[in-house]
């Protein structure tokens, strides 16, 4: 199946041109400079001549020129200017601003808490299964299996730190070698990027917002997948990560350090521990083949326990069974002996909602999964709304310029590296790459941060999470110190290698181009976003897992033809876009393939039929519900209460978004609303800080 459909007769657009290597980041689009594309991924693109009847763009612009959907929207400020306000108005505006800030911080707090609870929910639903993945003996010999186990486990427990700590404990216990652990760590790196992709799905309501948010989130996915694609074979062939980290570990005489500082957890833990508390040791115990752990619940019941090594009296059949006569006696009826036991006395129960319910882990997990997703979604909507009302006019201009503008020449290239450092620093502070990248996603969506700027921030986030792991490793007990430090360093150097591959040269920033391509597809066919998530994070890893279990022969037998077809398609695609004359006329486009193999349109029809039953009875009860509905069915016939279905005509027009080559993007006319230029509901209540 050709991955770049509907490119048959695409004619290059002479008006568009490639930007220089400096990669100047865009600010708010200027109408006078509309053709100056700021995306360093730009290439020729098809013009869309027809404009929708409702678009006001026809009254202002030339009909042949359309806005680049990747340009940041102008967040219009329709409020009264600060200078024009009277004292009462200024005071009112000031308190409104304070109120908004408090609300923003409040929703941000619950957003982060819901991410934590989402992780707990995933662990309750799939934690034990995740633990059992690790107990597979084939991991030692099959790096591909190790990789997919890393992905699946991290997706199932929604925490790369949990999966890496399991790996560390397995290496410390000699159940796993460092060599076998490296692919698992690579997989964990991929798995952790699902969180912000899920967060991006929550912004499905507005097409242009969703386009940016989803691309901004998946840039992380593509970076990780591409890094693994290149670095896993390199590691298997050279073992460079293993060798470098071993040299580092052996050259230093590390003493046990202190724990990595819990900065964000200090604030969120008081709340999240009232919802649920988990005994994460259970997953590790299952991974290490502890049979007893399989029947244990992950929900923590006792928080205060007293562990005492003591000798207890136990009965024995006869005095012959005694260890020594001095430790043996009778009570006249039974024979007794002394046995050394570690006695755990439960003192105080945990203070969380589920402590007295005694529900199975799956039930608790399902409840928490639904609730955390609802809270996550609700908080995200509110954050976007508040940011939307705050970031208008001059405020937006200042913020956008600060975040997205490069250093002056000749230091422009340094900006990205500073962003990497900022990303690493922020992740170190919040102690979680998932939290940082998830917080970044809505900002990309509403157009505060460009994807070009989000990319280095995300890369920095990947580094930040490994520095946390290194600190945690230094705090490990003696026996686990070496292995945990070596694994943490492998993680660190893997990410550094990935950055060296996909960042320094603008041409190599493939993840941005791929993410934008996926953003375009997902904006048009919103179901494709869910499809992508299932395929990349579940189906592909599970398929590889299944084939690996069947043995090397089966894996190679199926894998080689698949890889061959993918390479063939990519080569053909490259020739089609670069030098089509080399190819026979038939192969110069994809028209020789049936429509379902080169376009998502037929698939969209299938999905629409499948979800048709939901379309008529969509939920108009609330925005949250409506967004979920829109994600499923694009819902053009109802839900007038939400933005998600206001682009009825756009959906009915059926302008197919081509799944294009990485270096091309679509030009779609966006309504004023989609551009973010929504008029304020009441100018009296709107105010700007500047």
């Amino acid at each position: 199946m050709a991955p770049w459909p509907e490119l048959g007769d695409a004619q290059p657009n002479p008006d568009k041109y490639l930007e220089g290597a400096a990669g100047q980041q865009p600010t708010a689009p200027d109408k006078s400079k509309e053709t100056n594309k700021t995306d360093n991924t730009e290439a020729p693109v098809t013009k869309i001549e027809l404009l929708p009847s409702y678009s006001t763009a026809t009254l202002i612009d030339e009909p042949t020129e359309v806005d680049d959907p990747w340009n940041l929207p102008t967040l219009q400020d329709s409020g009264i200017k600060w200078s024009e306000r009277d004292t009462k108005g200024k005071i009112l505006c000031f308190f409104q601003g304070i109120g908004r800030l408090i609300l923003l911080l409040g929703f941000l707090y619950f957003f982060v808490c819901s991410l934590d609870i989402l992780s707990s929910a995933f662990q309750l639903v799939g934690g034990k299964m995740a633990g059992q993945f690790f107990s597979n003996s084939s991991i030692m010999s099959n790096p591909l299996l190790g990789l997919v186990i890393g992905v699946l486990v991290t997706v199932l427990v929604q925490s790369s730190s949990t999966s890496t700590s399991i790996v560390v404990s397995m290496v410390s216990s000699s159940l796993l070698t460092v060599r076998a652990a490296i692919p698992i760590i690579m997989g964990a790196n991929i798995g952790t990027s699902i969180t912000n992709t899920i967060v991006a799905l929550m912004q499905v309501g507005d097409r242009s917002e969703f386009r940016r948010a989803f691309a901004g989130a998946t840039v992380h996915d593509f970076f990780n997948w591409l890094s693994v694609l290149v670095l896993l074979p390199v590691e298997v062939a050279t073992h460079y990560l293993e060798i470098i980290t071993q040299l580092i570990v052996e050259s230093f005489h590390f003493k046990n350090g202190e724990d990595a500082p819990d900065l964000l957890k200090v604030i969120t833990k008081p709340f999240t521990k009232l919802i649920v508390q988990l005994d994460k040791k259970v997953i590790s115990q299952i991974a290490m083949n502890d049979e007893k752990a399989k029947n244990k619940s992950l929900v923590k019941i006792w928080c205060k326990t007293f562990t005492n090594k003591t000798q207890i009296n136990v009965t024995v059949p006869s005095t012959a069974n005694c260890t020594s006569p001095s430790l043996c006696w009778t009570d006249g009826i039974q024979n007794w002996t002394m046995k050394n036991v570690t006695y755990k006395e439960n003192i105080a129960k945990c203070q969380h909602i589920f402590v007295n319910f005694h529900l199975p882990d799956l039930a608790v997990g399902t409840i928490l999964l639904i609730l955390s997703l609802l809270v996550l979604c609700g908080c995200l909507i509110m954050i976007v709304k508040i940011l939307g009302s705050v970031l208008k006019g001059q405020v937006a201009t200042v913020i956008k310029k600060t975040i997205n503008t490069d250093f002056p020449f000749p230091f422009a290239w340094l900006t990205g590296y500073l962003a990497i450092l900022v990303g690493a620093g922020m992740t170190f502070i919040v102690q979680s790459s998932s939290v940082f990248t998830s917080a970044l996603t809505p900002l990309i969506g509403i157009g505060v941060i460009t994807i070009e700027r989000a990319y280095p921030l995300t890369l920095g986030s990947n580094i930040g999470t490994t520095t946390t792991a290194i600190l945690a490793a230094l705090a490990s007990p003696g026996n686990a110190l070496r292995s945990s430090l070596q694994i943490a360093l492998c993680h660190f150097f893997f990410n550094i290698s990935g950055i060296l591959l996909w960042y320094p040269i603008p041409f190599t920033r493939l993840p941005i181009r791929m993410a934008k391509g996926l953003g375009n597809i997902s904006a048009k066919y919103r179901w494709f976003a869910v499809f992508y998530l299932i395929i990349f994070f579940f189906l592909i890893p599970l398929t590889v897992f299944g084939l690996s279990l069947a043995g090397w022969r089966v894996l190679v037998g199926v894998g080689v033809p698949v890889v061959f077809i993918i390479i063939l398609v990519l080569c053909l695609r490259l020739l089609q876009s670069r030098c089509p004359r080399v190819l026979p006329k038939k192969l110069q486009n994809w028209n020789f393939l049936p429509l379902w193999m080169r376009s998502l349109k037929p698939w969209d029809a299938v999905v629409s039929k499948f979800t048709g039953c939901f379309q008529m009875r969509c939920c108009c009860c609330c925005r949250v519900c409506c967004r979920a509905c829109c994600l499923l069915c694009d819902c053009p016939k109802c839900c007038r209460c939400s933005k998600c279905c206001e682009d009825l005509e756009e959906a009915q027009e059926g302008q197919d978004v081509p799944v294009k080559a990485p270096e091309t993007f679509d030009n779609i006319t966006i309504s004023r609303e989609a551009q973010g230029e929504v008029p304020a509901s009441d100018s009296k209540t709107e105010c700007t800080a500047l």
């Epitope: 006569p325 001095s326 043996c328 009570d331 006249g332 009826i333």
Partner: antibody
Framework: QIQLVQSGAELVRPGASVKMSCKTS????????VHWVKQTPRQGLEWIGA????????SYTQKFKAKATLTVDKSSSTAYMQLSSLTSEDSAVYFC????????????WGQGTSVTVSS | DIVMTQSHKFMSTSVGDRVSVTCKAS??????VAWYQQRPGQSPKELIY???NRFTGVPDRFTGSGSGTDFTLTITNVQSEDLADYFC?????????FGAGTKLELK
């Protein structure tokens, strides 16, 4: 306080049987074993056997296996010992005693029941 | 069966003296030994368990010692009420067995 009160002295004919009681109080009857000990001037103290009131398990010394039968009545926290086929050899003072917790030592003793076998 | 031997049937002492009553087991019994005191016309009372642990309410002039096969009950500063029979008992393995007893009397 912990007390073990035994039934009064018995005068029985040879070949007959006797059943003596040991009423306990001041502790959880089912938690501690009840031991029976025979004392004669010639033999000194001899352990007859013990019973666990909680589960009814019994243990006898070989010499008394055919002679003694130990039972309990949990409702009245009373232990009983029946001696059968009595001979003059069985004339003695019989003590009931509470066993130490999971121990074979005896921490509290009854006042004793004197059994005289005579024709 | 384990035989507990108390070598002295009688031991003479004076008030205020120190006396040691001995007991020997026919095999290793560890520390599974108890000591009892029986005053004339009364039932036995437990003094020591686990060879050296004093039972509740027992005066500290009574001390138990020993392990394996040799055990000793020591009474320091003998009082007139201490004049009684003293029995050792093993509970290392069934059946429980007692020593023949040692009678403590005034010189």
């Amino acid at each position: 306080q912990i007390q073990l009160v035994q039934s009064g002295a018995e005068l029985v004919r040879p070949g007959a049987s006797v059943k003596m009681s040991c009423k306990t109080s001041g502790y959880t009857f089912t938690t501690y074993n009840v031991h029976w000990v025979k004392q004669t001037p010639r033999q000194g103290l001899e352990w007859i056997g013990a019973i666990s009131p909680g589960n009814g398990l019994t243990s006898y010394t070989q010499k008394f296996k055919a002679k003694a039968t130990l039972t309990v009545d949990k409702s009245s926290s009373t232990a009983y010992m029946q001696l059968s086929s009595l001979t003059s050899e069985d004339s003695a003072v019989y003590f009931c005693a509470r066993g130490g917790f999971r121990l074979g030592s005896m921490d509290y003793w009854g006042q004793g029941t004197s059994v005289t076998v005579s024709s | 069966d384990i035989v507990m031997t108390q070598s002295h049937k009688f031991m003479s002492t004076s008030v205020g003296d120190r006396v040691s009553v001995t007991c020997k087991a026919s095999q290793n019994v560890g520390t599974s030994v108890a000591w009892y005191q029986q005053r004339p016309g009364q039932s036995p009372k437990e003094l020591i368990y686990w060879a050296s642990n004093r039972f509740t309410g027992v005066p500290d002039r009574f001390t138990g010692s020993g392990s394996g096969t040799d055990f000793t009950l020591t009474i320091t500063n003998v009082q007139s009420e201490d004049l009684a029979d003293y029995f050792c008992q093993q509970y290392s393995s069934p059946p429980l067995t007692f020593g023949a007893g040692t009678k403590l009397e005034l010189k």
